[in-house]
């Protein structure tokens, strides 16, 4: 199966052009949400709508792919858990962090467990 080339997409939308070179998705406001991706092929240019998810920081986007460890234990003090990601692949010109840390709130179930553990420790 042929893989999509970095920055290059065959056959742009509604076009006879052979190879379209697509830039990054640039949100219309701030650093996430709906935006546009510009493409060029010879003298032709096109803009297509795209979206950068708002729950990702910029370096977590399609430009940077990470391999993540399992989630750590719930921290009862902060009500969050953490996992680390190691860079797996970056778009050629993307300046990605080698490692990243992601936090998320614990589910009510794990939060309760963590609190119970914390309580036991105090006895």
């Amino acid at each position: 199966v042929a893989k999509k080339k970095d920055k290059v997409k065959k056959g742009g939308p509604g076009s006879e052009c052979a190879e379209w070179a697509w830039g990054p998705c640039t949100p219309s406001s701030k650093d996430c949400g709906v935006g546009f991706r510009e493409g060029t092929c010879g003298a032709q240019t096109q803009r297509i709508r795209c979206r950068v998810p708002c729950n990702w920081k910029k370096e977590f986007g399609a430009d940077c792919k990470y391999k993540f460890e399992n989630w750590g234990a719930c921290d009862g003090g902060t009500g969050t858990k953490v996992r680390q990601g190691t860079l797996k692949k970056a778009r050629y010109n993307a300046q990605c962090q080698e490692t990243i840390r992601v936090t998320k709130p614990c589910t009510p179930k794990t939060k309760a467990k963590a609190k119970a553990k914390k309580g036991k420790g105090k006895d």
Epitope: K5, V8, K89, C96
Partner: antibody, heavy 117, light 107 residues
Framework: QVQLVQSGGGLVKPGHSLRLSCAAS????????MNWVRQAPGKGLEWIGM????????ILNQKFKDKATLSVDIAKNSAYLQMNSLRAEDTAVYYC??????????WGQGTLVTVSS | EIVLTQSPATLSLSPGERATLSCRAS??????LHWYQQKPGQAPRLLIK???QSISGIPARFSGSGPGTDFTLTISSVEPEDFAVYYC?????????FGGGTKLEIK
């Protein structure tokens, strides 16, 4: 820090093939694009293509589409350049380099390929 | 493909002088332009990435400017070890291309 050690160069007859190796040591070989570049004697630098070890995605200079094949072996932390149907004008020093947009690149020492009968 | 034209082909300077090397792209390449130094028998060494970003371990006398189509590598005060060939390279689109090089030689 990544160290790249190249091997496989030498004297080869016209029409023959040759496989060059680029062995990486140090951090994260599989995370970065591996470029192959050549330099004919007394000439400038010419990009052959690149491959990403994580999924073997390959982007080849169309000039070399019938000449070069890129591959990787993650288990051996190595990248390979197979050159086919060699001609006198393929005589050059061949370099591999590991590219990260964030930290820059690391180059192998280069390996000389001489095509002559 | 994007053509990079370097000038001058040869630059003759004395140590201590300021060196200005030019690289012009055949079309806009944003800031996707890198500068390399190469000495005889050695692999190229990256000096500046993305037009003006410094590289760890490279002396501060090397600096770059851009973006767009016209790029400059400046060596504020040339040291004896700086005499070498300098190449620019673009990574804006495939194939990656290099300029023809500028040879910095001792006057």
């Amino acid at each position: 820090q990544v160290q790249l050690v190249q091997s496989g160069g030498g004297l080869v007859k016209p029409g023959h093939s040759l496989r060059l190796s680029c062995a990486a040591s140090g951090q994260s070989f599989s995370s970065y694009w591996m470029n192959w570049v050549r330099q004919a004697p007394g000439k400038g630098l010419e990009w052959i293509g690149m491959i990403h070890p994580s999924d073997s995605e390959t982007i080849l200079n169309q000039k070399f589409k019938d000449k070069a094949t890129l591959s990787v072996d993650i288990a051996k932390n190595s990248a390979y350049l197979q050159m086919n149907s060699l001609r006198a004008e393929d005589t050059a020093v061949y370099y591999c380099s590991s590219w990260s947009a964030k930290r820059g690149d690391f180059w192998g020492q280069g390996t000389l390929v001489t095509v002559s009968s | 493909e994007i053509v990079l034209t370097q000038s001058p082909a040869t630059l003759s300077l004395s140590p201590g002088e300021r060196a200005t090397l030019s690289c012009r792209a055949s079309e806009s390449i944003s800031n996707n332009l890198h500068w390399y130094q190469q000495k005889p028998g050695q692999a190229p060494r990256l000096l500046i990435k993305y037009a003006s970003q410094s590289i760890s371990g490279i002396p501060a006398r090397f600096s770059g400017s851009g973006p767009g189509t016209d790029f400059t590598l400046t060596i504020s005060s040339v040291e004896p070890e700086d005499f070498a060939v300098y190449y620019c390279q673009q990574s804006n689109s495939w194939p990656l291309t290099f300029g023809g090089g500028t040879k910095l030689e001792i006057k």
